[in-house]
């Protein structure tokens, strides 16, 4: 079951997911100038058995000029750079060594991908917030958020995250004080 | 279930101080920060300000910057606000509200400055 | 500071209407906006958090609706229990205001 809305915004905070629940969608966006191309998939899905998930469907940019050029999916080192989410992902190798029963892994990038990865969040899954650099958490309680059904609606949770703005920018939950830990493994920036 | 109880009504005199407080059950105290709002006879709420009560932090409304003091007793899941240099327009219903969307709210505390 | 904007101050209804109250800020607040509910002597009643997630246990006929600067609460039929005074707050940053209120009475 999809969860009707994005997770809560937190003031000066971003959100990440450790792993994708399987039914997740992740739309194929490409930066200004590219465009998927004709036969491709409009998104990507996590699917999966009892031991293994993965990502169906594999998105693909090409020029928004050229005619029958398909660009390969493995990104160039400058591509990646581009990425906003790059800074934020290459804090978290870690979270390449988890592996939950049930959910994917953060998909790699493809080449000349939008800046903003847009997800569809499926019932259960749950996002971590960090406030973002130049912020500190004035309060940090729970710092996540999950999507859950009530009386057949779907409702993400409220974080009890507070940032505010001073120059010491705020570690992740996990990273600095172990009560709101997702096993200290937050993963890559999400932006719906 | 989640309660707020706030202290007693008090009155005090122009130029003394009042701390009223704001006792947290039913939940894990640490997780949810404490705001705190009055409400002045027949008028709207205003935000004076919120604590941590996790790490005691606060930011107060620029209006009472200098004359508010909010702490928290983590052992008792207390927390407290105390406004010094009391005026007769301080006379209002204090509450305290707990977490980002201030789900849920004390009962109130009467603070009447008089002479 | 952002200024919470709301209007009308007070709406006179029917049992069985259908109302609607609407909150302006001042700036771009995304949907960083609650609602509340205040009866005579009472505390304050959070209805609507995010400016459209319903908090719990909270009718259905409340709704909220509106991002960035513009805002509205629908009572879709009014109950006698719903006359009170309503309240919109940003919690984008510090300091988070209120609107002045909207006073809903019995017609």
């Known amino acids: 079951e999809l969860c009707d809305d994005d997770p809560p915004k937190i003031t000066h905070a971003t959100f990440k997911a450790v792993a994708y629940k399987e039914g997740t969608m992740l739309n194929c966006e490409c930066k200004r100038g590219f465009r998927r191309i004709k036969s491709g998939s409009p998104y990507m899905l996590c699917t999966g058995n009892s031991s293994h998930s993965s990502w169906d469907n594999q998105c693909q940019c090409t020029s928004s000029a050229a005619r029958n050029t398909t660009k390969q999916v493995t990104p160039q080192p400058e591509e990646q750079k581009e990425r906003k989410t790059t800074e934020m992902q290459s804090q978290m190798q870690l979270a390449d060594q988890v592996s939950l029963p049930g959910h994917c892994r953060e998909p790699p990038p493809w080449e000349n991908e939008a800046t903003e990865r847009i997800y569809h969040f499926v019932v259960g899954q749950t996002v971590y917030y960090q406030c973002v650099q130049g912020y500190r958490a004035l309060h940090r309680g729970p710092a996540e958020s999950v999507c859950k059904m009530t009386h057949g609606k779907t409702r993400w949770t409220q974080p009890q995250l507070i940032c505010t703005g001073e120059t010491e920018p705020s570690q992740f939950p996990g990273e600095e004080e172990p009560q709101a830990s997702p096993d200290g493994l937050p993963e890559s920036e999400t932006s719906r | 279930q989640v309660q707020l109880v706030q202290s007693g009504a008090e009155v005090k005199k122009p130029g003394a101080s009042v701390k009223v407080s704001c006792k947290g059950s039913?939940?894990?105290?640490?997780?949810?920060?404490m705001h705190w709002v009055r409400q002045a006879p027949g008028q709207g709420l205003e935000w004076m300000g919120v604590i941590s009560t996790y790490s005691g932090d606060a930011i107060y409304a620029q209006k009472f910057q200098g004359r508010v003091t909010m702490t928290v007793d983590k052992s008792t899941s207390t927390a407290y606000m105390e406004l010094s240099s009391l005026r007769s327009e301080d006379t209002a219903v204090y509450y305290c509200?707990?977490?980002?969307?201030?789900?849920?709210w004390g009962q109130g505390t009467t603070v009447t400055v008089s002479s | 500071d952002i200024q919470m904007t709301q209007s009308p101050s007070s709406l006179s209804a029917s049992v069985g209407d259908r109302v609607t109250i609407t909150c302006r800020a001042s700036q771009d607040i995304s949907n960083y906006l609650e609602w509340y509910q205040q009866k005579p002597g009472k505390a304050p009643k959070l209805l609507i958090y995010?400016?459209?997630t319903l908090a719990e246990g909270v009718p259905s006929r409340f709704s909220g609706s509106g991002s960035g600067t513009d805002f509205t609460l629908t009572i879709s039929s009014l109950q006698p229990e719903d006359f009170a005074t309503y309240y919109c707050q940003h919690h984008y940053d510090t300091p988070y205001t209120f609107g002045q209120g909207t006073k809903l009475e019995i017609k």
């Open positions: 039913g939940y894990t105290f640490t997780d949810y920060a």
């Open positions: 509200a707990r977490g980002v969307t201030f789900d849920y």
């Open positions: 995010n400016a459209k």
